[in-house]
Interface confidence: low
Amino acid sequence: HGTELPSPPSVWFEAEFFHHILHWTPIPNQSESTCYEVALLRYGIESWNSISNCSQTLSYDLTAVTLDLYHSNGYRARVRAVDGSRHSNWTVTNTRFSVDEVTLTVGSVNLEIHNGFILGKIQLPRPKMAPANDTYESIFSHFREYEIAIRKVPGNFTFTHKKVKHENFSLLTSGEVGEFCVQVKPSVASRSNKGMWSKEECISLTRQYFTVTN
């Protein structure tokens, strides 16, 4: 049977909160019958578990088998090419997949206008796969922070950045009118996780939203 097939050049995780996807690059000159076998190792249980015998895609959703990621020492994954009776050597992820590798996201951002202020509320992610007790705020229970980027339309497209330590934030518009667009990027001050910018949410501010106080 040999190992004439080349190995997948690289294997890596791309993960968000309870959305843990393993990716790999295809072998060169793969045929229509080439598929990929995926195995998973949990740190502390030093044996590989076969997860998929023959995936023809270049990614595999491992969320269901890594639900304890946030309470474990992490995982390694490996992938090899299979074509009929031939198979390649394994390619192993070159870093441990742990909570540190999870890219932080927000669920959504809601904006309201109150008397010249924009009040924002950050909704935390609520993935369907997450066990009931594993909420974003229970796993990242301290030092949650959010970078806020504000863009004024019309305008010269310059962004105002500020950092807040709360899922609610207040932006004073200084009496300006127009469309204000807001993006949010989460982080946790005590951790090194990357954060992803949310999609832009916009709200229009017109004169009717201002009340004059003496």
Epitope: F117, V164, K165, H166, N168, F169, S170, S174, T213
Partner: nanobody, 125 residues
Framework: QVQLQESGGGSVQAGGSLRLSCVAS????????MAWFRQSPGKEREAVAV????????LYTDSVKGRFTISQDNAKMTVYLQMNRLKSEDTAMYYC??????????????????WGQGTQVTVSS
């Protein structure tokens, strides 16, 4: 000296009115935001109203909208809270607060740096 001094609290029947005053030192009156918070026994301190002193823009918590008005008198370096149609659930110690600049949520007590000693408001039904 950095200080905030509240006055105007007292006892009133439900449906009545009170006006609270908060006199600030010059340094504090030049802050960006001043606010009234309240705290009743066994509960967390909650924001009632916030004013942005540079423009007079105001924010109110839902439970007091239409009943309470926050305002300022720049000459007297004073912020007021006019409380009308008072209810028994408005009974609390009322505190004046100020912060020079904040990137945090304005209805969060932790966002504010400077606090007065408080004035008691009791509404009886």
């Amino acid at each position: 000296q950095v200080q905030l001094q509240e006055s105007g609290g007292g006892s009133v029947q439900a449906g009545g009115s009170l006006r609270l005053s908060c006199v600030a030192s010059r340094y504090l009156y030049s802050t960006n935001y001043m606010a009234w918070f309240r705290q009743s026994p066994g509960k967390e301190r909650e924001a009632v109203a916030v004013i942005y002193t540079a423009s007079g823009a105001t924010l109110y918590t839902d439970s007091v909208k239409g009943r309470f008005t926050i305002s300022q008198d720049n000459a007297k370096m004073t912020v007021y809270l006019q409380m009308n149609r008072l209810k028994s659930e408005d009974t609390a110690m009322y505190y004046c607060a100020a912060v020079r600049k904040t990137d945090s949520y304005l209805f969060d007590a932790q966002s504010f740096t400077y606090w007065g000693q408080g004035t008691q408001v009791t509404v009886s039904s």
